[in-house]
């Protein structure tokens, strides 16, 4: 369960890939599209509001007999719109929604090497936001092999 309904902290940050491509958001035909692209030097990076929530993970679920806490995030590039996992389509989409946000809008935060982070779907453990064909997609990751995969690594810069 997510502890409380309010985030423990929030920050505005630009999101980029391990290879320094920017994640950008564009309004097209009354819906938002998400792009992964090289930005021209003078172009300002899009900012995302990251809201961080603490999630209690009871020992009955954790499998190691320990009550643990996870850090979860929601990502909102513009008012009332949040990134959401569409597990059926293996896609990442921007949806307008009201609070309380659906579980599909929550991602477990992982710290990685090179000061990068990864975002794991709350609704589908082992599935991460990643980059595929210059778009964001959901990527299934084999824990034993690919946790360092560059396509699921992202940089946050305030």
């Amino acid at each position: 369960s997510i502890t409380g309904i309010s985030p423990i902290t929030e920050s505005l940050a630009s999101l980029s890939t391990y290879n320094d491509q920017s994640i950008t958001f564009a309004l097209e035909d009354e819906s938002y599209e998400i792009y992964v692209e090289d930005l021209k030097k003078d172009k300002k990076k899009d900012k995302v509001l990251l809201s961080y929530y603490e999630s209690q993970h009871p020992s009955s679920e954790s499998g190691d007999g320990v009550d643990g806490k996870m850090l979860m995030v929601t990502l909102s590039p513009t008012k009332d719109f949040w990134l959401q996992a569409n597990n059926k389509e293996h896609s990442v989409e921007l949806h307008k929604c009201e609070k309380p946000l659906p579980d599909q809008a929550f991602f477990v935060l992982h710290n990685r090497s090179f000061n990068c982070v990864s975002f794991e779907c709350k609704t589908d453990p082992g599935v991460f936001i990643g980059v595929k064909d210059n778009h964001l997609a959901l990527i299934k990751v084999d824990y034993s092999e690919n946790l360092g995969s560059e396509n699921i690594l992202f940089k946050l810069s305030e």
């Epitope: 423990i8 190691d64 320990v66 643990g68 806490k69 996870m70 477990v108 992982h110 360092g148």
Partner: antibody
Framework: QVHLKESGPGLVAPSQSLSITCNVS????????VHWIRQTPGRGLDWLGV???????SYNSALMSRLSISEDISKSQVFLKMNDLQTDDSAIYFC???????????????WGQGTLVTVSA | DIQMTQSPASQSASLGESVTITCLAS??????LAWYRQQPGKSPQLLIY???RLADGVPSRFSGSGSGTKFSFKINNLQAEDFVIYYC?????????FGGGTRLEM
């Protein structure tokens, strides 16, 4: 009950290497990162590196060329190896566990008791 | 690397009083700051994480505040066991650097 315990050689000769083992219990290395920190009266607390859940490793770049961190998940052990020790590497070496699953943003919730390493001929 | 400047280096206080310790980061670290205390001959103990959150089992007379680059740590109603060393640590980016410590003296 979460428990971490370091075991090291105590005394190391200059230019030799240091190996310390961190034995952990009460939690899974597949969920929590384990960090190495050292403490000296002169320099205070220095973060050395981390073995993250999932096996990726980050090092303090100032010491990266001399450091190696590894694990044996089946034995719930994390290892620190440091090469070419000098007298100013004399310190108490600690291992510590992340507060959060998968993330270091919440600090280090559990620490080992530390092991004193003295570098001397 | 992010430098953490902790002040004062030492402070005197009496039982029952309040004290405040400050930590300044050389660049913005959001809310990713922890506070620890260390008793002589022991390992550090987490008191505050994410700048303001009280760690499990820590009394409510301890509190933290701040974000970005300036952070504060306050102890109300000082007890005998509080006269030890306190450290801040940034966890925004590696290397996860510590402040130089504050020794609280009676």
């Amino acid at each position: 009950q979460v428990h971490l315990k370091e075991s090291g050689p105590g005394l190391v000769a200059p230019s030799q290497s240091l190996s310390i083992t961190c034995n952990v219990s009460g939690f899974s290395l597949s969920k929590y990162g384990v960090h190495w920190i050292r403490q000296t009266p002169g320099r205070g607390l220095d973060w050395l590196g981390v073995l993250r859940a999932g096996g990726t490793i980050s090092y303090n770049s100032a010491l990266m060329s001399r450091l190696s961190i590894s694990e044996d998940i089946s034995k719930s052990q994390v290892f620190l190896k440091m090469n070419d020790l000098q007298t100013d590497d004399s310190a108490i070496y600690f291992c510590a566990r992340d507060h959060y699953y998968y993330s270091s943003f919440g600090g280090f919730a559990s620490w080992g008791q530390g092991t004193l390493v003295t570098v001397s001929a | 690397d992010i430098q953490m400047t902790q002040s004062p280096a030492s402070q005197s206080a009496s039982l029952g009083e309040s004290v405040t310790i400050t930590c300044l980061a050389s660049q913005t670290i959001g809310a990713w700051l922890a506070w620890y205390r260390q008793q002589p001959g022991k390992s550090p103990q987490l008191l505050i994480y994410a700048a303001t959150r009280l760690a499990d089992g820590v009394p409510s007379r301890f509190s933290g505040s701040g974000s970005g680059t300036k952070f504060s740590f306050k102890i109300n109603n000082l007890q005998a066991e509080d006269f030890v060393i306190y450290y801040c640590q940034q966890l925004n980016s590696t290397p996860y650097t510590f402040g130089g410590g504050t020794r609280l003296e009676m």
